[in-house]
Interface confidence: low
C-alpha cells in the first residue's frame, strides 16, 4: 500500500564460519522527504503481540542525535556489525566476522518519524567454505574456443577470495599456451552477491579426459575446490608409415595408416588415401580394424609425391601428416634454356640444362652444334662474354648414379651484334672531276639481326637512291669525306672515304715580288705566278703579254726593265684537268722624258703675218709636268706649255727652237727645229 516501505537486498546471503557478510541494501520510506531516525538489527526476532514490539538479540541499534547532519552516513560500528548506509536510501550492512550460528533470519527495523518497517534478511552460513560451481558448454571441440566459468555466491570486502584454475594439477595462467584469457569479476548488488572467474581457451585433442579444477583461496590458503573432466570431441588422429620412403623405379612400397585415437569413436574404419592433395583411386588396399594398408606395386616416377590418409567421425575428417615418397630414376630427356636469347655480343649468357632426375643429376655433358664442350660438367653453362661464334645449337646430357638421359631438344643461341667491317665504297669513274656525279655504296661483312637502315655523314650530302646507296650530283672541288653506317639495333660506322675530286688550278693571280715600290726604267723586276690549290698538284706555269705567250715558268724576270716592257701580263697555270688564267696585271715602267722633238704647224716655212704653232712632242711616264722653250740664241721664251704660239709672224722669228720637258723622274731636251718666216708678197711689193 502507499504506507509500505520498499526495501531491496539479496534473497539469501551465503558465507562460512570466520568470513564476513556484506548485505547490499536499498530502501524508500512512504514519505518522500522522511529521514531515518532509528535503525535496529535483530537476530532470531519475534513480534510480541501484547507489547506490539519486536524482541530478540539486538546486533545493532543506532538513533539519530542532534549532531547528525541531514543525510550523513551513520558509520557507526557496534560489535561485529557496521552500518554502511545513510538516512535517505541506503541500508547496507556488514557483519564481520560471521559465525555459523548466524544462519537464519535477521530483522532490520527502521523508523522514520511515525513510519516504521521490519525487513527480514536470510543468511546461510556454513561451518566450512562451500565448493565453487563450474559452468561448461554441453559440447567441447578441439581447437574451438570454449569458456568455463567458476563461481562462488560470496563476496565481502575485507575478506578477499581468489579463484584459480588448474589443468591436471598444473596452474593455468593467461600466458599458458592455448589460453586466450582469464577474467575475474566480483558482483555485489541488491540482487546478487558472487565472485566469478572465466577461463577462455582452445583445447587440444590431447586435453580430452583431463581434469580441470577451480580452487578458492584466501590469504594463499585453499578454502575449497571443484573438479570437472574435459570431454573434448576431436576428429580421428591418424599415423602414417611408408616403407621404404625412397625407392627405385619398378620396386614396390607399402604404406600403413593407423587410427590412433578418435572421440567420438569411428562408426566404420573407412580410410581414404590422398596423393599431392588429390584422392587416390584404383589402388590395392587392405583394411583392418583401426588400420589400412596401401600397396604400390612396380613404382613409377609419377608415384613420387606427398601421401596422406584420412578417416572421419561425427566431428569431421581427420588427416595424417604428409609423408613424401621419393622415387629414384635416371635422368629424363633434357632440354636447354638460354638466358637471354637472343643475346647481345659481349653480354653474359647462361645456359641451363633441364632434366628431371632422382637423385638430381650430378654430371652434365654440354654440346655445341653436336660437338662436346670439354670441361663444363655443371647444370649451368656460363659464357661470360658471348661472341658471334658462340651462336648455334646447344644440347646437354644429364647423368646420375642410375644412368644418363637422352637429348630431347636443342636450344638455339642467337647472338646479336652490330654490323661488322662496314666500308664506304666509291662506285664512280676515277678520277672524280669537279661537277661529276658520284655514287657511294655502304657495305658490311655480317650483321645479326639483318641491317635495317643506313646512315650517311655528312647528312644531306646527297640523295639516297636505295638503302645503302648514296648519289652526290655535281660534286664540288672541296667535297668533305663521306662515311656511312649500317644499322640493325645498333649502328656501325665505316671510316670516312675521301672523294679526291680532281679540278683545274684555282685562284690564279700575279704577284709582284720586286721591287717593293713603283717600277722605274732600268730596275730589276720579278713577277711570280701564284694559285690556291690544284688536284692533281702537278702544274705548269705560262706568261702572256697583251694576249701573246711570252715564256713558261713560275717567275717572269726583267734584268733592266724598259718602257717597252710595259703592258698587260697574264699568268696561266695548268694541270691534267685544265688551265686557269689569272686576271690581267698591268706593268707600268716609269721613265724620264725622252724622244723630245719640236714639230711646227702648219710647216717649217711660214709667211710673215701668219700664225705658227710649235709643239713639244715627247715619250714620258709619268707625262711631262713642265715645259721650257728656247730660241736659237738659247733665250728662255718663258712659255711653260706643251705648245708655243707665234702670231703674227715676223721675219725676225726665223731661227731654231728647242723645248725641254720635266716629269717626276727627270728632264729631256729636244734637238733644234728651224722655223723660216718669209716675206709676204705685199712686203716684197713695197720694196
Amino acid at each position: 500500500s502507499a504506507n509500505d516501505w520498499t526495501v531491496d537486498h539479496p534473497q539469501t546471503l551465503f558465507a562460512w564460519e570466520g568470513a564476513c557478510i556484506r548485505i547490499p541494501c536499498k530502501y524508500k520510506t512512504p514519505l518522500p522527504k522522511a529521514r531515518l531516525d532509528n535503525i535496529l538489527l535483530f537476530q532470531n526476532y519475534e513480534f510480541d503481540k501484547a507489547t506490539k514490539k519486536f524482541t530478540g538479540t539486538v546486533l545493532y541499534n543506532a538513533t539519530k542525535t542532534e549532531k547528525d547532519p541531514e543525510s550523513e552516513l551513520y558509520l557507526s560500528k557496534q560489535g561485529r556489525v557496521t552500518f554502511l548506509g545513510n538516512r535517505i536510501d541506503n541500508c547496507t550492512l556488514k557483519i564481520h566476522p560471521i559465525r555459523a550460528n548466524d544462519s537464519g533470519n535477521l530483522g532490520l527495523r527502521m523508523t522514520a518519524g511515525t513510519e516504521r518497517w521490519m525487513e527480514p534478511i536470510h543468511l546461510n552460513v556454513s561451518e566450512k567454505p562451500f565448493q565453487p560451481y563450474i559452468q561448461m558448454p554441453s559440447e567441447i571441440r578441439e581447437s574451438q574456443s570454449v569458456t568455463l566459468t567458476c563461481g562462488l555466491n560470496f563476496s565481502c570486502f575485507g575478506y578477499d577470495i581468489l579463484l584459480k584454475w588448474f589443468l591436471e594439477d598444473s596452474e593455468i595462467t593467461s600466458i599458458t599456451s592455448s589460453v586466450t584469457s582469464i577474467t575475474s569479476s566480483v558482483t555485489s548488488s541488491i540482487k546478487n552477491v558472487y565472485t566469478e572467474s572465466k577461463l577462455t581457451f582452445q583445447p587440444k585433442w590431447t586435453d580430452h579426459g583431463k581434469s580441470v579444477k577451480c580452487q578458492v583461496q584466501h590469504s594463499s590458503k585453499v578454502l575449497s575446490e571443484r573438479t570437472v573432466r574435459l570431454d573434448v570431441k576431436y576428429t580421428p588422429k591418424l599415423e602414417i608409415k611408408v616403407n621404404p620412403t625412397e625407392v627405385e623405379k619398378n620396386n614396390s612400397v607399402t604404406m600403413t595408416c593407423r587410427v590412433n585415437s578418435s572421440n567420438p569413436k569411428l562408426r566404420t574404419v573407412a580410410v581414404s588415401w590422398f596423393k599431392d592433395g588429390r584422392p587416390l583411386e584404383d589402388q590395392e588396399l587392405e583394411q583392418e580394424q583401426q588400420m589400412s594398408k596401401l600397396i604400390l606395386h612396380s613404382v613409377t616416377k609419377d608415384m613420387r609425391g606427398k601421401y596422406r590418409c584420412q578417416a572421419s567421425n561425427d566431428i569431421g575428417p581427420g588427416e595424417s601428416e604428409e609423408v613424401e615418397l621419393t622415387v629414384h630414376y635416371a635422368p629424363e630427356p633434357s632440354r636447354v634454356h638460354i638466358y637471354p636469347s637472343p643475346a647481345e655480343e659481349g653480354q653474359s649468357v647462361e645456359l641451363i640444362c633441364e632434366s628431371l632426375a632422382s637423385p638430381s643429376a650430378t654430371n652434365y655433358t654440354w654440346y655445341h652444334n653436336r660437338k662436346p664442350i670439354p670441361g663444363d660438367t655443371q647444370e649451368k653453362l656460363r659464357i661470360p662474354k658471348v661472341s658471334p661464334w658462340h651462336a648455334g645449337n646447344y644440347s646437354c646430357l644429364a647423368e646420375n648414379r642410375l644412368g644418363h638421359g637422352k637429348i630431347d631438344q636443342e636450344a638455339k643461341l642467337d647472338v646479336h651484334y652490330a654490323p661488322k667491317a662496314v666500308t664506304t665504297v666509291i662506285q664512280s669513274f676515277t678520277p672524280i672531276l669537279e661537277g661529276d656525279s658520284v655514287t657511294l655504296v655502304c657495305r658490311y661483312n655480317s650483321s645479326n639481326p639483318d641491317v635495317t637502315s643506313y646512315r650517311w655523314n655528312p647528312q644531306g650530302s646527297g640523295s639516297v637512291l636505295k638503302p645503302g646507296v648514296l648519289r652526290i650530283q655535281k660534286v664540288t672541288w672541296d667535297s668533305m669525306p663521306v662515311s656511312c653506317a649500317a644499322c640493325n639495333h645498333k649502328c656501325s660506322w665505316a671510316l670516312p672515304v675521301i672523294l679526291n675530286v680532281h679540278y683545274a688550278p684555282r685562284d690564279v693571280k700575279v704577284l709582284k715580288v720586286s721591287p717593293a715600290s713603283e717600277i722605274r726604267a732600268g730596275q730589276r723586276v720579278l713577277l711570280q705566278c701564284d694559285f690556291a690549290e690544284s688536284n692533281p698538284a702537278e702544274v705548269r706555269f705560262f706568261w702572256k703579254k697583251n694576249g701573246s705567250l711570252v715564256q713558261e715558268g713560275r717567275y717572269l724576270s726583267f734584268g733592266s726593265v724598259s718602257p717597252e716592257d710595259s703592258g698587260n701580263y697574264n699568268c696561266m697555270v695548268n694541270n691534267s684537268i685544265g688551265e686557269t688564267l689569272s686576271q690581267a696585271w698591268n706593268l707600268q715602267v716609269l721613265y724620264a722624258p725622252r724622244r723630245l722633238r719640236v714639230s711646227i704647224s702648219p710647216g717649217d716655212h711660214v709667211m710673215e703675218g701668219k700664225k705658227a704653232t710649235l709643239s713639244c712632242e715627247s715619250d714620258a711616264n709619268p707625262p711631262i709636268s713642265q715645259y721650257t722653250w728656247f730660241d736659237s740664241s738659247g733665250q728662255d721664251l718663258h712659255s711653260s706649255g706643251q705648245k708655243l704660239r707665234l702670231e703674227p709672224l715676223e721675219v725676225q722669228h726665223t731661227g731654231s727652237y728647242r723645248c725641254k720637258g720635266t716629269n717626276g723622274i727627270g728632264t729631256g731636251e729636244s734637238p733644234p727645229s728651224t722655223l723660216t718666216v718669209y716675206y709676204s708678197p705685199e712686203t716684197i711689193g713695197k720694196r
Partner: antibody, heavy 120, light 112 residues
Amino acid sequence: QVQLQQPGAEIVRPGTSVKLSCKASGYTFTDYWMNWVKQRPGQGLEWFGAIDPSDSYTRYNQEFKGKATLTVDTSSTTAYMQLSSLTSEDSAVYFCARSDYTYSFYFDYWGLGTTLTVSS
Amino acid sequence: DIVMTQAAFSNPVTLGTSASISCRSSKSLLHSNGITYLYWYLQKPGQSPQLLIYQMSNLASGVPDRFSSSGSGTDFTLRISRVEAEDVGVYYCAQNLELPWTFGGGTKLEIK
C-alpha cells in the same frame, strides 16, 4: 658483408685529371662487374660505364667515352675511374656499384659516393 | 639511347595510405625471352641508391612486401601499399635492356 669503400671528397683544378677509387671487400672481386654512376647536385643518375675485373673488359656510355677510363687492380680488389680534362660540368657525386654477370645486371650494392669538386 | 621518363614529384600522400609512382620508357623493355628489364631504385636523403625491384616485378632481398611493381612494355607503376615515414626519398626507374643503361629523372615521394 659486401662493402664498397670510396673516398668522401676530391677537390681538383679545371683542366687536370683525377683518379677515383672504389675498394671492394666481402665478396670475390672478379665474379662481379663494377659500374660507375654520376649524380650532379639535385639531379638524376647517369651510368658512366662498367668493367669486368676478371679480364678488364670495359663497356662505356659513349657520351662519356673520352672523359672516363676504367681500370682495376685485382691484387688490392680496387676499381678506378680516371676523369680527364676536368671542367665544372664534371663536379658531381660519383658512385661505384656492383652488378652480377648475368643479364639481370642490376646494381645490388653501392658505394657511399665520392664528391668531386672542380674549382680554380 | 632508351629514354626513361618520370614526374619530378608524386602526389602528396598521407602516412598509412597507398602511393603510386609512374615511369615510361621510349622503347619496350619486354625482351623476346619474356623478361621485362625494368628496375626500381630508392635513394633516401643523404644515402646511396638501393635496389627495390628487379625485372619489373621481383622484390629485392630485404625489401618489405608493401612495395610492388607492374606494367606493360613501356608503362610501369611502383605501388607502396601503406606508406611509412622511412619510405621518403627519390624513386628512380632504370632499364638495362640496351646499352647504355639509363635511369629516369627520379620522382620525389612527398608526405602530406
